[in-house]
Interface confidence: low
């Protein structure tokens, strides 16, 4: 018996061939012997089956001795053995219809689980293999689950269903809703303007929700809400904003915040949370601000940084074009009685300079100049 696999919603064509290459009497029945369709001369006749409005044939092929059964908009319950009767012969074809669907929605938040459910006819024992856009293979039976979805899981998942040595392929487009970066860090000299950007890693027609930026300043004992906002069809409107600092927010995506001045009291970590309409759960992006200050007080030249720096970062003070006078894995370095000239305070990671502040040290009778 020939086995044909079909996909729910698709069209399938079951073949039936006579030895005579001409139009002769034929008809198709299901396993209950109920007539589906056949011919009377050059006319197509249909029987009382449930397939009535979805069954068809190709009259153009009858003259060649081919009498196909075409079933449109396949349903799982169309799985059956179909019998073609022609020239006193019976050709049997077993049709197995499968469907593969994603749980609830194909737009899922980062960290959520994706469950793919296989609809299959009773008595079948299919195996499924799915390949994610990043090339990860998963196998299973009636359900496949992937926990903790990552950004790279966005895209087309290709799933192959295997039954009776036959394969049928499904493609499901999954969109993982997330920020492009889980975390970012901004390095600024004291007094500079700070730009925070929160680009999303997906595009959708309409985007509605609300968000908030909580900030934990290094010097503060508790965190505070810096800004809350609404998102309506990709338009941003500020609901509430703190007065210190005076934050400004862009009106369009990507989400964009401006802090007029980087000051030591603002250095710290923030968490931007975005709750999207009709989604359970929230998107998060961490943002960090590191602020540097170089000062000269009497005979002491000091360089300090505030904010979340990792222990591997190096803070150095050096006279321009000379070797570093002092380099430490600490948040403050200083030089006593610095010689006159342009001094550089450098924050670096494995030799790469992340932040630099210059201060001009004048002879002791002058006042220091901060460029």
């Amino acid at each position: 018996k020939k086995v044909v696999l079909g996909k729910k919603g698709d069209t399938v064509e079951l073949t039936c061939t006579a030895s005579q290459k001409k139009s002769i009497q034929f008809h198709w029945k299901n396993s209950n012997q109920i007539k589906i369709l056949g011919n009377q001369g050059s006319f197509l006749t249909k029987g009382p089956s449930k397939l009535n409005d979805r069954a068809d044939s190709r009259r153009s092929l009858w003259d060649q001795g081919n009498f196909p059964l075409i079933i449109k908009n396949l349903k799982i319950e169309d799985s059956d053995t179909y019998i073609c009767e022609v020239e006193d012969q019976k050709e049997e074809v077993q049709l197995l219809v499968f469907g593969l669907t994603a749980n609830s929605d194909t737009h899922l938040l980062q960290g959520q689980s994706l469950t793919l459910t296989l609809e299959s006819p009773p008595g079948s024992s299919p195996s499924v293999q799915c390949r994610s856009p990043r090339g990860k293979n998963i196998q299973g039976g009636k359900t496949l689950s992937v926990s903790q979805l990552e950004l790279q899981d966005s895209g087309t998942w290709t799933c192959t269903v295997l039954q009776n040595q036959k394969k049928v392929e499904f493609k499901i487009d999954i969109v993982v809703l997330a920020f492009q970066k889980a975390s970012s860090i901004v390095y600024k000299k004291e007094g500079e303007q700070v730009e925070f950007s929160f680009p999303l890693a997906f595009t959708v027609e309409k985007l509605t929700g609300s968000g908030e930026l909580w900030w934990q300043a290094e010097r503060a004992s508790s965190s505070k809400s810096w800004i809350t906002f609404d998102l309506k069809n990709k338009e941003v409107s500020v609901k509430r904003v703190t007065q210190d600092p005076k934050l400004q927010m862009g009106k369009k995506l990507p989400l964009h915040l401006t802090l007029p001045q980087a000051l030591p009291q603002y250095a710290g970590s923030g968490n931007l949370t975005l709750a999207l309409e009709a989604k359970t759960g929230k998107l998060h992006q961490e943002v960090n601000l590191v602020v540097m200050r170089a000062t000269q007080l009497q005979k002491n030249l000091t360089c300090e940084v505030w904010g979340p720096t990792s222990p591997k970062l190096m803070l150095s003070l050096k006279l321009e074009n000379k070797e570093a006078k002092v380099s430490k894995r600490e948040k403050a370095v200083w030089v006593l009685n610095p010689e006159a000239g342009m001094w550089q305070c450098l924050l670096s990671d494995s030799g790469q300079v992340l932040l630099e502040s210059n201060i001009k040290v004048l002879p002791t009778w002058s006042t220091p100049v901060q460029p």
């Epitope: 990860k136 196998q139 295997l162």
Partner: antibody
Framework: QVQLVQSGAEVKKPGSSVKVSCKAS????????IDWVRQAPGQGLEWMGG????????TYAQKFQGRVTITADESTSTAYMELSSLRSEDTAVYYC???????????WGQGTLVTVSS | DIQMTQSPSSLSASVGDRVTITCRAS??????LNWYQQKPGKAPKLLIY???SLQSGVPSRFSGSGSGTDFTLTISSLQPEDFATYYC?????????FGGGTKVEIK
């Protein structure tokens, strides 16, 4: 308990081919990918490629593309790795290992030493 | 391909010591990192999968942590049978890649 049993040690001449087998027993290993990983003497682990026996899907490391062929016989639950155009630097222990959903190798074969020498 | 860098390449420790091995990926691998133990002449053995999940049958003195690019394998109290070579492996992107290994020797 899943077990992966590999074929015995081989001594080969440069330019020839070697085919190593890996028989799975005691579990539904056909549903899983079987990867091949090699380890040169005193060196680290190097991924060569893999197959999902149930589907015949193969993936190869670029370094071995064209020289390695991984196959599987579902009826005997056996995976095979054939490496052609052997050179002395292919002298290594070749392992088969079962891959889980998380991309880790939870069961390993005992290893097959292939020595390439003229 | 993603490069996996293990450090240190070797270390000497005594029974009862707390041992930490680090593994760094050249780009984010989320939590798709696995740790293996290998003894001379034997196949590697899975200890930790998905960065921090302990493989069944592995003693609880082994633990894993980290996500993104930096990961750690910790042995809280080194036992005589723990002297071996340890490998990390990323499974986030094809092809899977291994770290160079860390040999834990008796002091």
């Amino acid at each position: 308990q899943v077990q992966l049993v590999q074929s015995g040690a081989e001594v080969k001449k440069p330019g020839s081919s070697v085919k190593v087998s890996c028989k799975a027993s005691g579990g539904t290993s056909n549903n899983y990918a079987i990867d091949w990983v090699r380890q040169a003497p005193g060196q680290g682990l190097e991924w060569m490629g893999g197959i999902i026996p149930l589907f015949g899907t193969t993936t190869y490391a670029q370094k071995f593309q064209g020289r390695v062929t991984i196959t599987a016989d579902e009826s005997t639950s056996t995976a095979y790795m054939e490496l052609s155009s052997l050179r002395s630097e292919d002298t290594a222990v070749y392992y088969c290992a079962r891959v889980t959903l998380y991309g880790d190798y939870d069961y390993w074969g005992q290893g097959t030493l292939v020595t390439v020498s003229s | 391909d993603i490069q996996m860098t293990q450090s240190p390449s070797s270390l000497s420790a005594s029974v009862g010591d707390r041992v930490t091995i680090t593994c760094r990926a050249s780009q984010s691998i989320n939590r798709y990192l696995n740790w293996y133990q290998q003894k001379p002449g034997k196949a590697p053995k899975l200890l930790i999968y998905a960065a921090s999940s302990l493989q069944s049958g592995v003693p609880s003195r082994f633990s894993g942590s980290g996500s993104g690019t930096d990961f750690t394998l910790t042995i809280s109290s080194l036992q005589p049978e723990d002297f071996a070579t340890y490998y990390c492996q990323q499974a986030n992107s094809f092809p899977p890649t291994f770290g160079g290994g860390t040999k834990v020797e008796i002091k």
